[in-house]
């Protein structure tokens, strides 16, 4: 599995998306877990509703929420009030019985402020960027706004 890097600013919300084949994973609940070490377990953080048909309902565990668009095939995780200790390696999982398939490996990185990205001189917006071996970076914040541009909706 490739690893996708999502970056957010401390104190703000970060939204992580995990696309999947909706037919292949039909009827399966999903989960978000944190990898504790190279060979360690992936510790469950939050999982979707016990009833698969209600997977669209947002479920919270602390400051982490999960919701699943089962028709569109997109699992969305929201990390609210992002903190330095939220940085780490995570997985989006599809559950079947006692087994779990990895949908996406996600590296969450927390910026002290929006300028703490390596390409600090450039204006950038959410989207794919530089590579980390076989990873790519999803920027979930904007650096600044040019005149006339519409800002992102505020996160709470």
């Amino acid at each position: 599995h490739n690893t996708t890097v999502f970056q957010g600013v401390a104190g703000q919300s970060l939204q992580v998306s995990c696309p999947y084949d909706s037919m292949k994973h039909w009827g399966r609940r999903k989960a978000w877990c944190r990898q504790l070490g190279e060979k360690g377990p992936c510790q469950r953080v939050v999982s979707t509703h016990n009833l698969w048909l209600l997977s669209f309902l947002r479920r919270w565990n602390g400051s982490t929420a999960i919701t699943d668009d089962t028709l569109g095939g997109t699992l969305t995780i929201t990390l609210r009030n992002l903190q330095p200790h939220d940085a780490g390696l995570y997985q989006c999982q599809s559950l079947h019985g006692s087994e779990a398939d990895t949908l996406r490996k996600v590296l969450v990185e927390v910026l002290a402020d929006p300028l703490d990205h390596r390409d600090a001189g450039d204006l950038w917006f959410p989207g794919e960027s530089e590579s980390f071996e076989d990873a790519h970076v999803e920027h979930s914040i904007s650096r600044s706004l040019l005149e006339g541009e519409i800002p992102f909706p505020p996160t709470s």
Partner: antibody, heavy 121, light 107 residues
Framework: QVQLVESGGGLVKPGGSLRLSCAAS????????MSWIRQAPGKGLEWVSY????????YYADSVKGRFTISRDNAKNSLYLQMNSLRAEDTAVYYC??????????????WGQGTTVTVSS | EIVLTQSPATLSLSPGERATLSCRAS??????LAWYQQKPGQAPRLLIY???NRATGIPARFSGSGSGTDFTLTISSLEPEDFAVYYC?????????FGGGTKVEIK
């Protein structure tokens, strides 16, 4: 065993440049955030900079922002600190340290022996 | 910036005595606090992380406690090799900061 070895320190004139290196061994370097911490003579510890495992997220203390650049080469298991426009107050022992979390921030659980940087005319 | 204030600045004790070091944060750091030991001419060494967890290889005589803003490092019975400077450090919020240090010296 897990080890960090710094090099590149020395005597430099104010306004000059220096590049510090840190060679890592005994662990999977690309799994860890890395940092530089310094200690002025007779003083306490000060964070200088850190870099994420991917190299795409960086942090600098206000005192060095715009003058210092941290970088890493995961293929070479190496961490670097490029120091430009050096000032007398940058005189310190510079330590390379590993942040203990797996792909994450945390306390520094492995430290190098330090390399001394002296800025003086 | 979270300011960490360590007290006392110097602690004069004899081997075998109990040492109690304090670290106070200007705002809550939850349990994201570490303690380091540094001897002259050496790099710091991690003793305690997450306020109360001993790092690998650290003797049981070292213990940490506290949460929020008030933290304590206790050395139950000082050994000769424990005389050093001790720093606390928070990684709860940017920028990460260190306390000014407490020197534990032989009385």
């Amino acid at each position: 065993q897990v080890q960090l070895v710094e090099s590149g320190g020395g005597l430099v004139k104010p306004g000059g440049s220096l590049r510090l290196s840190c060679a890592a061994s005994g662990f999977t370097f690309s799994d860890y955030y890395m940092s530089w911490i310094r200690q002025a003579p007779g003083k306490g510890l000060e964070w200088v900079s850190y870099i994420s495992s991917s190299g795409s997220t960086i942090y600098y203390a206000d005192s060095v922002k715009g003058r210092f650049t941290i970088s890493r080469d995961n293929a070479k298991n190496s961490l670097y600190l490029q120091m430009n426009s050096l000032r007398a107050e940058d005189t310190a022992v510079y330590y390379c340290a590993r942040l203990g979390g797996y792909y994450s921030l945390g306390p520094m659980d492995v430290w190098g022996q330090g390399t001394t940087v002296t800025v003086s005319s | 910036e979270i300011v960490l204030t360590q007290s006392p600045a110097t602690l004069s004790l004899s081997p075998g005595e109990r040492a109690t070091l304090s670290c106070r944060a200007s705002q809550s750091v939850s349990s994201y606090l570490a303690w380091y030991q540094q001897k002259p001419g050496q790099a710091p060494r991690l003793l305690i992380y997450d306020a109360s967890n001993r790092a690998t290889g650290i003797p049981a005589r070292f213990s940490g406690s506290g949460s929020g803003t008030d933290f304590t490092l206790t050395i139950s019975s000082l050994e000769p090799e424990d005389f050093a400077v001790y720093y606390c450090q928070q990684d709860s919020a940017f920028p990460f900061t260190f306390g000014g240090g407490t020197k534990v010296e032989i009385k």
